[in-house]
């Protein structure tokens, strides 16, 4: 509408008793320069006088400024486009409507701006993203609908009452569109932050507390687990029993399923928090963990390495190398599965015990024809002695001896 003056400013400004208010404002008059400006508080139009009644906070005419009792009110504008105002300090009873009465040579206009002054500093507002997941960086925002050049403030972040180490970025806006102070904090929450209280604290320039807002963090995370095993060292003998228990320390959202894994593979029909292994066999040795899932995903406990100890199994002998040429060297290796590893070996040549040979390997540096035959061994550990296996045959090759002619 070309018959209107054009104004731009925030619709409502907020402050508190003793602070100040800065009102960014621009305008465009219908014709020529501004000749008279009056700032009213709660103006009301009087039909009888065709004038506005109300408290005059500020007045200026083409003849110059009228000395105002209210030195706290300043018109920082000009005669054709700036109508910025400042009230410092601002008082509770300044709340209400501010009326900017503008007069040019031929035109008049009343522009209204709302002012909301509270008794005490009002709290900022913390804004969180709709969902927070563990280890994913989020931005926490603290917004206060206040900023004023004459009243410096600061916003501080606290986690469970302790200042947060992360650097926050504070920005202010004092424009015709918006007036605010904002602090943004980048933060990578861990699962342990779930349920913790984050505070944004409004402070004055000296760090004195003015107000705050608090939120409780809702950090989505996979189930966090602890595993316990009995016996605690997870070392048992064949035939013993083992119990593993899994405890969920925290899950958000609720956990739904439980399973047990052995060497990374799921154990069938094991869907409770207790895993009972009765009369264990050696092939149940391995790495065990529990897995509990929620909507975020599966959580796994640490691995428990179960060692099932057993006496040595029947031994086999490996010969390096057979057949062997007379004078060459040969090595025999006794192989037997056992846990713990065998500590003692007994060697046999053609069924007869080889004296002084108690190691896993037997080394013969110079093979003679009489070394040929069957070699076998027996392994022994703390749980017992294994059985003698079938043995291995050493074939010794040699040149003709004691040649006789017939």
């Amino acid at each position: 509408d070309s018959s209107k003056w054009v104004f731009e400013h925030p619709e409502t400004l907020y402050a508190w008793e003793g602070a100040c208010v800065w009102i960014p404002c621009t305008y465009r008059a219908l014709d020529g320069d501004l000749e008279s400006f009056i700032l009213f508080h709660n103006p009301e139009y009087n039909k009888n006088t065709s004038k506005f009644d109300g408290t005059r906070l500020y007045e200026s005419t083409k003849d110059g400024k009228v000395p105002s009792e209210q030195k706290r009110v300043q018109f920082l504008g000009d005669k054709n486009k700036n109508c910025t105002l400042s009230i410092h300090p601002v008082h509770l009873n300044d709340s209400g409507q501010l009326g900017l009465r503008m007069e040019s040579k031929t035109e008049k206009w009343m522009e209204r701006i709302h002012l909301n002054v509270s008794e005490r500093p009002f709290p900022p507002h913390i804004q969180l993203p709709p969902e927070i997941q563990e280890s994913q960086e989020v931005t926490l925002t603290c917004l206060l609908n206040f900023s004023c050049y004459g009243y410096p403030i600061q916003l501080q972040w606290l986690l469970e009452g302790v200042p947060m180490r992360q650097a926050a970025v504070t920005s202010t806006s004092l424009t015709i569109k918006s007036v605010f102070t904002r602090s943004e904090l980048k933060f990578s929450p861990q699962w342990s932050h779930h349920g913790k209280i984050v505070t944004c604290q409004l402070q004055d320039a000296d760090g004195k507390f003015l107000s705050n807002d608090t939120v409780q963090l809702n950090v989505k995370h996979t189930p966090k687990l602890e595993i316990k095993v009995t016996p605690s060292d997870a070392i048992v003998r064949e035939g013993d029993s083992v119990t593993m228990t899994c405890e969920v320390s925290s899950s958000n959202p609720e956990y739904t399923t439980v399973s047990w894994l052995k060497d990374g593979t799921s154990l069938k029909k094991q869907n409770t928090f207790t895993l009972n292994l009765r009369e264990v066999t050696k092939d149940q040795s391995g790495k065990y963990c529990c897995q509990v899932s929620n909507d975020v995903g599966p959580g796994r406990s640490e691995e428990v390495f179960l060692q099932v100890q057993y006496a040595p199994e029947p031994s086999t002998v490996q010969i390096l190398h057979s057949p062997a040429v007379e004078g060459s060297q040969v090595e025999f290796l006794c192989m037997s599965l056992a846990n713990p590893l065998p500590t003692n070996y007994t060697w046999y040549h053609n069924g007869k015990e080889m004296q002084g040979r108690t190691e896993e390997k037997v080394h013969i540096p110079k093979i003679l024809p009489w070394h040929a035959g069957t070699y076998s061994c027996v392994a022994e550990n703390i749980l017992g002695t294994g059985q003698r296996g079938p043995g291995a045959e050493l074939d010794v090759q040699y040149p003709p001896k004691k040649v006789t002619t017939v």
């Epitope: 228990t245 405890e247 969920v248 899950s251 959202p253 609720e254 956990y255 928090f273 207790t274």
Partner: nanobody
Framework: QLQLVESGGGLVQAGGSLRLSCVGS????????MGWFRQAPGKEREFVAA????????TYSDSVKGRFTISRDNAKNTVYLQMNSLKRDDTAVYVC??????????????????WGQGTQVTVSS
């Protein structure tokens, strides 16, 4: 839907004992952390005790420690609260609840998703 039903409440003399039971419908009871809470007339709901699914983690409120014992039988989908040396202050409606969020939240009522109707325990002097 998991349903919980308490029983075992009643009137008992101060110094006496009671054993409360809570039976759950469905297999999920065996994987739930189970807790007992109580509410006396005109007072807020108060945490009493909780037990983890395996029974390996047990917590009690300071007011019942040493007098009450929580236990469970997963095969029967049942949780028990053995209450000894009962006092007048123990008078309340006792409610059992199921939690699928872990033992760190065992005393936080808001983390329990399923609740029973409760059983009245009255301790007279």
């Amino acid at each position: 839907q998991l349903q919980l039903v308490e029983s075992g409440g009643g009137l008992v003399q101060a110094g006496g004992s009671l054993r409360l039971s809570c039976v759950g419908s469905g297999d999920r009871v065996s994987i739930a952390l189970m807790g007992w809470f109580r509410q006396a007339p005109g007072k807020e709901r108060e945490f009493v005790a909780a037990i983890s699914p395996s029974g390996g983690r047990i917590t009690y409120s300071d007011s019942v420690k040493g007098r009450f014992t929580i236990s469970r039988d997963n095969a029967k989908n049942t949780v028990y609260l053995q209450m000894n040396s009962l006092k007048r202050d123990d008078t309340a409606v006792y409610v059992c609840a199921a939690n699928f969020r872990g033992y760190l939240s065992s005393s936080r009522g808001s983390d329990y998703a399923y609740w029973g109707q409760g059983t009245q325990v009255t301790v007279s002097s």
